[in-house]
Amino acid sequence: SYQVICRDEKTQMIYQQHQSWLRPVLRSNRVEYCWCNSGRAQCHSVPVKSCSEPRCFNGGTCQQALYFSDFVCQCPEGFAGKCCEIDTRATCYEDQGISYRGTWSTAESGAECTNWNSSALAQKPYSGRRPDAIRLGLGNHNYCRNPDRDSKPWCYVFKAGKYSSEFCSTPACSEGNSDCYFGNGSAYRGTHSLTESGASCLPWNSMILIGKVYTAQNPSAQALGLGKHNYCRNPDGDAKPWCHVLKNRRLTWEYCDVPSCSTCGLRQYSQPQFRIKGGLFADIASHPWQAAIFAKHRRSPGERFLCGGILISSCWILSAAHCFQERFPPHHLTVILGRTYRVVPGEEEQKFEVEKYIVHKEFDDDTYDNDIALLQLKSDSSRCAQESSVVRTVCLPPADLQLPDWTECELSGYGKHEALSPFYSERLKEAHVRLYPSSRCTSQHLLNRTVTDNMLCAGDTRSGGPQANLHDACQGDSGGPLVCLNDGRMTLVGIISWGLGCGQKDVPGVYTKVTNYLDWIRDNMRP
């Protein structure tokens, strides 16, 4: 039976009809009492006092209502949940993930996890209704957990008409013996000891470091991973592991050449709620590699949206060469990551100037052959984009990747809903398309336009009359990603390039074939 529920947009928690709850008001000491009425939350301020007993974890401040028994926790930055039990910065799980309290909410199949408090899970052995739910990390959220000491975090997903458990795609903190770091590398305990310039790290117990804060003599040295060694560490919450070095007889520090453990192509996908011409409105967390590129024009004031882009490493964006035919100076370009609404700043967005951009030397502006470009983001360090739930790299494909014909893939972008629309979309959209066989990706299928080996075709193969809402890329989506699931990760297969109209039956969109440019990409990204 269909149930009316309320979703608190601020906390993403769900509530049944007539259920009430308290919530803190962000950036103030006020607390609101909310009530679920016909699918809408109705909220008003209520007086509160300090809790008589501690109920909040991780340094949360507990307040309880004056006139009834409910309580609310004001969580410090980095924590969330009813009792501040959720660690929003946990980027991976240790061991089996029994203690994992992060916010990953996608199963290995790509399905979105179900909220543990959902009434549909009431009869399941593990749900947020259990008396020991808080201890097990379960509650009013849909984050992956391992309450039953299974081999890794899991959750319930709805598939084939029923709710069943499935392992999550949450990254493991230590995959095999790979000597790499997650997040900013605060937990890195590997043995790399060279900096990005090739210099050897000084031992943390070196006499030369006397007077420095981060040495083996630091009272917290053991917890920070410092000791009688010269391995790279990040004891101060910097962007990535670093170490002290001697350069020209001068004591300084440098970031290390430790590779970042790849979390590329992992995302927290949420099912789009709204259909729109040409696709579906989407959240940036479902496409965290999507970039929006804006340009200042010599003739007009302000910036205007130019094209999509794809985050492929911390400081590099892939896009389409044809977006840069106006030969903008790099300082006239801006790249925005982590934005759902095209021109509305997102809470967690990251904005960058462009250091330089490289357009393929053999780009043909008639045929759009070699339609590929690289943009280097400007940064004071060797790190630019910081990984988060809304900003993450896509995986580049292996050189020999050959997906079967008609594989379902997806594209995303802020482009127009239809070819004749005068406006770009106000919100990020996604579209689901299938890879065409090369025999169906030829000039004769595309009004005799040139189609080269550097291009691939993809389109919506659903049947339907003239009113069918076929998914496709459109103007403004150029430079954005065509991604397909490969080995459990979203992998970049194409760059949105060109097409004949948008969403026309049996007319595929044309994409730059990324596997043909892997060496070009790597070559141009060299330090």
Epitope: P398, A399, R522, R526
Partner: antibody, heavy 114, light 112 residues
Framework: QVQLVQSGAEVKKPGASVKVSCKAS??????INWVRQATGQGLEWMGR????????GYNQKFQGRVTMTRDTSISTAYMELSSLRSEDTAVYYC?????????WGQGTLVTVSS | DVVMTQSPLSLPVTPGEPASISCRSS???????????LDWYLQKPGQSPQLLIY???NRASGVPDRFSGSGSGTDFTLKISRVEAEDVGVYYC?????????FGGGTKVEIK
């Protein structure tokens, strides 16, 4: 610190193929390049492979005869040269490239002789 | 292909004295990403080559500061401020900007 250990010396007949391996430890995400040096001669770049994605860039001089592959599970890169001739007798080096070829293998002597 | 021409072919040196090797490329070796991938390698007798200088003027880790690199466009120089006995071997310049990457013919440095 990156360390590269190459397979041992090989003796081959003209027309045969040789496959040289290069096992990496340390940061294995850098390009692996292959460079050869005939006795008493200079260095000659043959090509490169990205151990991650497997993409390659070859010197056209060897195109069609050289194949570079990798096995990420054992952090090993391979260079196979086919249709060997006497002038392919040389020491073959693998070298790891980040900002330059900073780390080199010890070299593998390949002798082509009938 | 970019041809790298080194001079001199052979360089007899006196320990403690300076030495200089020149390298000229047949075309500009500025990469499309703006970097100039001009490196210098030293191959000591019976050993694998070792990196001395990368990207024209950057000294590799552990390389003594008596080695320095300079130049731009098509003309590049490696200087040793005071030659030591351990510096003998063949010095190669190398361009990694245009495929195929190419080495110079080498300069043999030996003690007089």
């Amino acid at each position: 610190q990156v360390q590269l250990v190459q397979s041992g010396a090989e003796v081959k007949k003209p027309g045969a193929s040789v496959k040289v391996s290069c096992k990496a430890s340390g940061n294995t995400s850098y390009w692996i390049n292959w460079v050869r040096q005939a006795t008493g001669q200079g260095l000659e770049w043959m090509g490169r492979i990205d151990p991650g994605g497997g993409s390659t860039g070859y010197n056209q001089k060897f195109q069609g005869r050289v194949t570079m592959t990798r096995d990420t599970s054992i952090s090993t890169a391979y260079m196979e040269l086919s249709s060997l001739r006497s002038e392919d007798t040389a020491v073959y080096y693998c070298a790891s490239y980040y900002y330059a070829m900073a780390y080199w293998g010890q070299g593998t002597l390949v002798t082509v002789s009938s | 292909d970019v041809v790298m021409t080194q001079s001199p072919l052979s360089l007899p040196v006196t320990p403690g004295e300076p030495a200089s090797i020149s390298c000229r490329s047949s075309q500009s070796i500025v990469h499309s990403n703006g970097n100039t991938y001009l490196d210098w390698y030293l191959q000591k007798p019976g050993q694998s080559p070792q990196l001395l200088i990368y990207k024209v003027s950057n000294r590799a880790s552990g390389v003594p500061d008596r080695f320095s690199g300079s130049g731009s466009g098509t003309d590049f120089t490696l200087k040793i401020s005071r030659v030591e006995a351990e510096d003998v071997g063949v010095y190669y310049c190398f361009q990694g900007s245009h495929v195929p990457w190419t080495f110079g013919g080498g300069t043999k440095v030996e003690i007089k």
